[in-house]
Structures are given as structure tokens and as C-alpha cells.
Interface confidence: medium
């Protein structure tokens, strides 16, 4: 995933290296809120592979992806905003093994917000990059329903009311 | 239908993979399970692969096992197997709309270690 | 990850009784519970998922019931081609699963 002017591209498996594997996104978030379709090859075009991912001091790498985990406490929203501000996302959960790597970086046992929400427009859960959740993989444990936010707590996730204010992980 | 195949006895240590071949149904979009069931014992499921490609491992199987999948096929690879792993494997396919529920099995194909 | 217990491991039942087994989850699984049903040299087959919902082609006699920790199959008017072992599986997310199979229950027709 990449970040642009507070517009998130979705690459296909992390890696950009050549068009064919450019995945268009349509519904994507942008920084005022609205929602846009976009497709552009050439932000996709620079990304490549895990070895030349460079992370930003405070930052730590895993998988070719950089995550920041926060101290304070922000609701869903200013987190989401948050991110954006420093070229990144909320956090998405690709597999099992980044799912142990934040466990692993979480030290408290409380929830923490991650790039996901009940959009009304949908409902359905939508990961910030506009893909759906995997209901399969996923069971989010609480109502999904308008203002309904994601929180990762012990390697599970919770609906809770976007509202409440929670520490939140960045990802890029 | 499913078919696996693959197991035989083995020697403790010895990488073992089996093959679960799908017929009449696209591997790549479904949900594919193994589970494996020890002699005279429960059942105990292993791990899927989605249709994005994640892979998914119960907590006692990480680091035991790998699977991987082919447009027709799904296998499992028994990293170091040890006695405690003689059972035989099936292999399953989750056709629930939702929720995850087995739908369709393959015979199971048994190794011995 | 939630874990499964199944009561009673073996059960007897008369031709034409009534056999009930019990599927407690450690947590809250809501509706996500299946039960299979397996003969001797067989996969298993699925009876039941989302704790009520009959699969295609599986006789009325069987039903399930429950939500939330306690989930319960039933059959009703048994006959000898319900000897088999049983399980109940909850399916509420495969990322959070240690086992998702009971531990089986064996129905013995008499």
C-alpha cells in the first residue's frame, strides 16, 4: 500500500514492480473524507520488493512494511487522520504472520485501533485500502453497525464505537 | 471431489508433503482445509489457504507444517515429522457462506512416521 | 482461540430413542457451530452448521440447537445407521483457532 497526497493505493501483494500486477482500487478514502475512483500505475510503479524498504527512524520493519506503534490515545478518526498525515495508513492485516508481529510489539493488553470500519454506505467492514474483510478469517466480536471501528486486541478484534479513544498502529 | 495422496511411512525428520488434487471445483477461489486425525483419535484441523492466498495455521500447528496451492492442487508439507504425527490427512473444502464449515472431504491418505 | 469439549464421549441408544450430545465453547462462538458425523474408515460428513441449519440431503431426525457457549445435537427416532462418532466444530475465524473440532462423542445403536 502506498500513500499519496492522502489517497491509498493498493498494490497487489505488496509489490509494484511491473503493471501487471497494478490492482485497481476504485473506492478509495482521501484526506477530506470523499471518496474517489483513481488508478495510477506510476506511484504503484516504485515500490518493489522487501529488501529496498528503508524505515523511518521509530519505525519498525517487517515484511517489507514499516509500522509505528503510538503511545497515546486517539479515537479512530484522529488516529486514521494520524497516519495519513505521515504518508501511511491505519493498519490492515495481510496473514498469520504479521498478525504474531504486532502481537509480539503490542506490550499492554489493551485494544488498539486498526485501519478497519463499518461503512454504512457498504454494510459491510472495509479495510482503509477499500477492500473488504475476510469474514472467514476474521470474526469481529461485537455490532457492526454505523460508527462501528476495529480494534485489535490479543490477536482478536472488537467493534467498538469509533469515538472511544485508543491507541492505534501506522502502517506503510 | 478431493483426492489426496502422498503418505506413506517415513523416518522421524523426514519432510513429507502431500497432495490434495480437486476435481469438479477451482482450488484457487475455495477455502482448502487439512485436517488429520490420529489412530483411534479426534479430529484436529491443521490450516487453510484462502482464495487471496493468506495461510492460515492453528496455534499448535505453526512452524509444524506449510501449505501451499496450485490452480488444481493444495499441498502439505510436514516439516520434521515426528510419531506424534502418524494420522491420516484430509483434506477439506469450506463452502459455507459464512462462518467456516466443511462441506466436502477427501478420503484421507495415511502417514506413518 | 476457543476450545471445544464434548459431553459425554459415548453414549448408548435405543432403535427408535432419542440420543442428545452436548458442545460447550470456552467463548462466545454466537451461531458458528457445525456437526459431523463420522463412520468407521470414512471422512466426516457434515450434518449441521451455523448450530441449526440442516446440510443438503442429511435426514430431519437430526437437529441442533444453542448459541453463545452451549450448543446441543439431537436425534430423534435413531436408527442403526446413526452409529457413528460425532463432532461439533465452532467456525468463527480461522485466525483465531487452536482446535476448532469437540473431542467426539461415539454413539453405540443397540
Known amino acids: 500500500l502506498l500513500v499519496s497526497q492522502g489517497v491509498l493505493l493498493k498494490c497487489q501483494k505488496g509489490s509494484c514492480s511491473n503493471a501487471t500486477q497494478y490492482e485497481d482500487t476504485g473506492d478509495l478514502k482521501v484526506n477530506n473524507g470523499t471518496r474517489r475512483n483513481i488508478s495510477n500505475k506510476d506511484l504503484c510503479a516504485s515500490r518493489s520488493a522487501d529488501q529496498t524498504v528503508l524505515c523511518q527512524s521509530e519505525w519498525l520493519k517487517y515484511q517489507g512494511k514499516c509500522y509505528w506503534f503510538s503511545n497515546e490515545m486517539k479515537s479512530w478518526s484522529d488516529s486514521y487522520v494520524y497516519c495519513l498525515e505521515r504518508k501511511s495508513h491505519l493498519l490492515i492485516i495481510h496473514d498469520q504472520l504479521e498478525m504474531a508481529f504486532i502481537q509480539k510489539n503490542l506490550r499492554q493488553l489493551n485494544y488498539v485501533w486498526i485501519g478497519l470500519n463499518f461503512t454504512s454506505l457498504k454494510m459491510t467492514w472495509t479495510w482503509v485500502d477499500g477492500s473488504p474483510i475476510d469474514s472467514k478469517i476474521f470474526f469481529i466480536k461485537g455490532p457492526a453497525k454505523e460508527n462501528s471501528c476495529a480494534a485489535i486486541k490479543e490477536s482478536k478484534i472488537f467493534s467498538e464505537t469509533c469515538s472511544s479513544v485508543f491507541k492505534w498502529i501506522c502502517q506503510y | 471431489s478431493l483426492e489426496e495422496s502422498g503418505g506413506r511411512l517415513v523416518t522421524p525428520g523426514t519432510p513429507l508433503t502431500l497432495t490434495c488434487t480437486a476435481s469438479g471445483l477451482t482450488v484457487g477461489s475455495s477455502y482448502m482445509s487439512w485436517v488429520r486425525q490420529a489412530p483411534g483419535k479426534g479430529l484436529e484441523w491443521i490450516g487453510v489457504i484462502v482464495p487471496s492466498g493468506s495461510i492460515w495455521y492453528a496455534n499448535w500447528a505453526k512452524g509444524r507444517f506449510t501449505i501451499s496451492k496450485t490452480s488444481t492442487t493444495v499441498d502439505l508439507k510436514i516439516t520434521s515429522p515426528t510419531t506424534e504425527d502418524t494420522a491420516t490427512y484430509f483434506c477439506a473444502r469450506d463452502g459455507a457462506s459464512s462462518g467456516f464449515y466443511f462441506d466436502l472431504w477427501g478420503q484421507g491418505t495415511l502417514v506413518t512416521v | 482461540a476457543s476450545d471445544m469439549t464434548q459431553i459425554p464421549a459415548s453414549v448408548s441408544a435405543v432403535v427408535g430413542g432419542t440420543v442428545t450430545i452436548d458442545c460447550q465453547a470456552s467463548e462466545d462462538i454466537e451461531s458458528y457451530l457445525a456437526w459431523y458425523q463420522q463412520k468407521p474408515g470414512q471422512p466426516p460428513k457434515l450434518l449441521i452448521y451455523?448450530?441449526?441449519d440442516l446440510a443438503s440431503g442429511v435426514p430431519s431426525r437430526f437437529s441442533g440447537s444453542g448459541s453463545g457457549t452451549q450448543f446441543t445435537l439431537t436425534i430423534t427416532g435413531v436408527e442403526c445407521a446413526d452409529a457413528a462418532v460425532y463432532y461439533c466444530?465452532?467456525?468463527?475465524?480461522?485466525?483465531?483457532?487452536?482446535?476448532?473440532f469437540g473431542g467426539g462423542t461415539k454413539v453405540v445403536v443397540k
Open positions: 466444530q465452532q467456525g468463527h475465524g480461522y485466525a483465531h483457532v487452536d482446535n476448532a
Open positions: 451455523d448450530a441449526s
